[in-house]
């Protein structure tokens, strides 16, 4: 039994659970997902039993081996996978455990603006970046672009302090997860702060 193998997949994609077996005479191989049997292979008779019908189309063993390829991945395919190789030549089955994380492809992140104030010609507010569907394991980075700056800021919240008369700045939120990355529509400081020019404590989203 080797160490747990971590695998990553994307919704709609495929993942292969690699299995290299040194066992000479294999009686059966059983693949399990979260304690539920998934597939049983009996090499002798060339039998492959897929436990659940809905998985029949999604399960494959590429190149005639025993590595399991799972296609059309769904978010709820995330979990623990376990393979047991059973042989009369072994006292204990040879086992391997895998952890699969399935991530969604990220849509454009949405940006909302917090309470905005305008004091002494300086517009102060927070921009918050988030995914509409609450995707997990998303890392946010802000890019602040302008003649005077090209800065990155980590985290979903970007504090802004922009003085009227300064050169305009553009803010872009970049969202990433292990399988994809996307960016928000650009936000211009001047447009963002126009609403606060007349109203000292305005709030908008």
């Amino acid at each position: 039994s080797g160490p747990v193998k971590e695998l990553v997949g994307s919704v709609g994609g495929a993942v292969t659970f690699p299995l290299k077996s040194k066992v000479k005479q294999v009686d059966s191989i059983v693949w399990t997902f979260n304690t539920t049997p998934l597939v049983t292979i009996q090499p002798e008779g060339g039998t492959i039993i897929v436990t659940q019908n809905r998985n029949r189309e999604r399960v494959d063993f590429p190149d005639g081996g025993y590595s399991l390829k799972l296609s059309k991945l769904k978010k709820n395919d995330s979990g623990i996978y376990y393979v047991g190789i059973y042989s009369s030549s072994l006292q204990q089955p040879s086992t391997q455990e895998y952890v699969l994380h399935v991530y969604e492809h990220l849509s454009k992140p949405k940006v909302t603006m917090g309470l905005q104030s305008n004091k002494n010609g300086t517009c102060v507010t927070n921009l918050t970046c988030c995914m509409e569907h609450g995707e997990e394991d998303v890392i946010y980075t802000w890019k602040a672009l302008g003649q005077a700056a090209n800065e990155s800021h980590n985290g979903s919240i970007l504090p802004i302090s922009w003085r009227w008369g300064e050169s305009d700045m553009t803010f872009i939120c970049v969202a990433r997860n292990p399988v994809s990355r996307n960016f928000s529509s650009p936000i211009l400081a001047r447009k963002l702060c126009e609403g606060a020019a007349d109203d000292p404590d305005s709030s908008m989203v």
Epitope: L7, V8, G9, S10, G13, V15, Y103, H105, K143, L145, S152, T170, I172, V174, R176, P178, V179, S180, R181, F183, S185, P186
Partner: antibody, heavy 119, light 107 residues
Framework: EVKLLESGGGLVQPGGSLKLSCAAS????????MSWVRQAPGKGLEWIGE????????NYTPSLKDKFIISRDNAKNTLYLQMSKVRSEDTALYYC????????????WGAGTTVTVSS | DIVMTQSHKFMSTSVGDRVSITCKAS??????VAWYQQKPGQSPKLLIY???TRHTGVPDRFTGSGSGTDFTLTISNVQSEDLADYFC?????????FGGGTKLEIK
């Protein structure tokens, strides 16, 4: 020094196959998305596709999806492009490229490797 | 696919002049545009990204502008070493696409 070095190009017959490699050095290859871009003689640039750091996502230009396969080996710091069913219009200089800070624009390019499809 | 059109295949200019290279996207790409310079026999080199942000080490005579569908790379005080092909690239949506290129010739 950050470097990309392509290899594997050469003369291949129409309908044939070829595997290109791109050896990366001077940066943490396993953290970066990587792309292949090609340039036909005297022509513009054409993005072929990209692969994410752990190979779980590969995006292609739709017209090339069925004939090219992008893969990588992080242990060897190497990116690959498997070409199959090649035609004369695949004759080009093939570059591997790294996106700046994992964004979408490319700040590091290899010198390229030439593929010539001819009988 | 988004088509990036660089209407001028060639542009001629003199040392010290100012020249503008244009690129038109077939649909709105926001500011997700980069510009590259490719000198004869060399690989492309990143000049501009996010339509107007200069890449590290790029001389300030190179300026990018535009948003939506119309983009411009302006080179002021053109130098002889600016003789090259210039390409725009959109990265607003897959597949990423490049313009056909504009070859800058120095008189």
């Amino acid at each position: 020094e950050v470097k990309l070095l392509e290899s594997g190009g050469g003369l291949v017959q129409p309908g044939g196959s070829l595997k290109l490699s791109c050896a990366a050095s001077g940066f943490d290859f396993s953290r970066y998305w990587m792309s292949w871009v090609r340039q036909a003689p005297g022509k513009g640039l054409e993005w072929i596709g990209e692969i994410n750091p752990d190979s779980s996502t590969i995006n292609y230009t739709p017209s090339l999806k069925d004939k090219f396969i992008i893969s990588r080996d992080n242990a060897k710091n190497t990116l690959y492009l498997q070409m199959s069913k090649v035609r004369s219009e695949d004759t080009a200089l093939y570059y591997c490229a790294r996106p700046d800070g994992n964004y979408w624009y490319f700040d590091v390019w290899g010198a390229g490797t030439t593929v010539t499809v001819s009988s | 696919d988004i088509v990036m059109t660089q209407s001028h295949k060639f542009m001629s200019t003199s040392v010290g002049d100012r020249v503008s290279i244009t690129c038109k996207a077939s649909q709105d790409v926001g500011i997700a545009v980069a510009w590259y310079q490719q000198k004869p026999g060399q690989s492309p080199k990143l000049l501009i990204y996010w339509a107007s942000t200069r890449h590290t080490g790029v001389p300030d005579r190179f300026t990018g502008s535009g948003s939506g569908t119309d983009f411009t790379l302006t080179i002021s005080n053109v130098q002889s070493e600016d003789l090259a092909d210039y390409f725009c690239q959109q990265y607003s949506s897959y597949p990423y696409t490049f313009g056909g290129g504009t070859k800058l010739e120095i008189k």
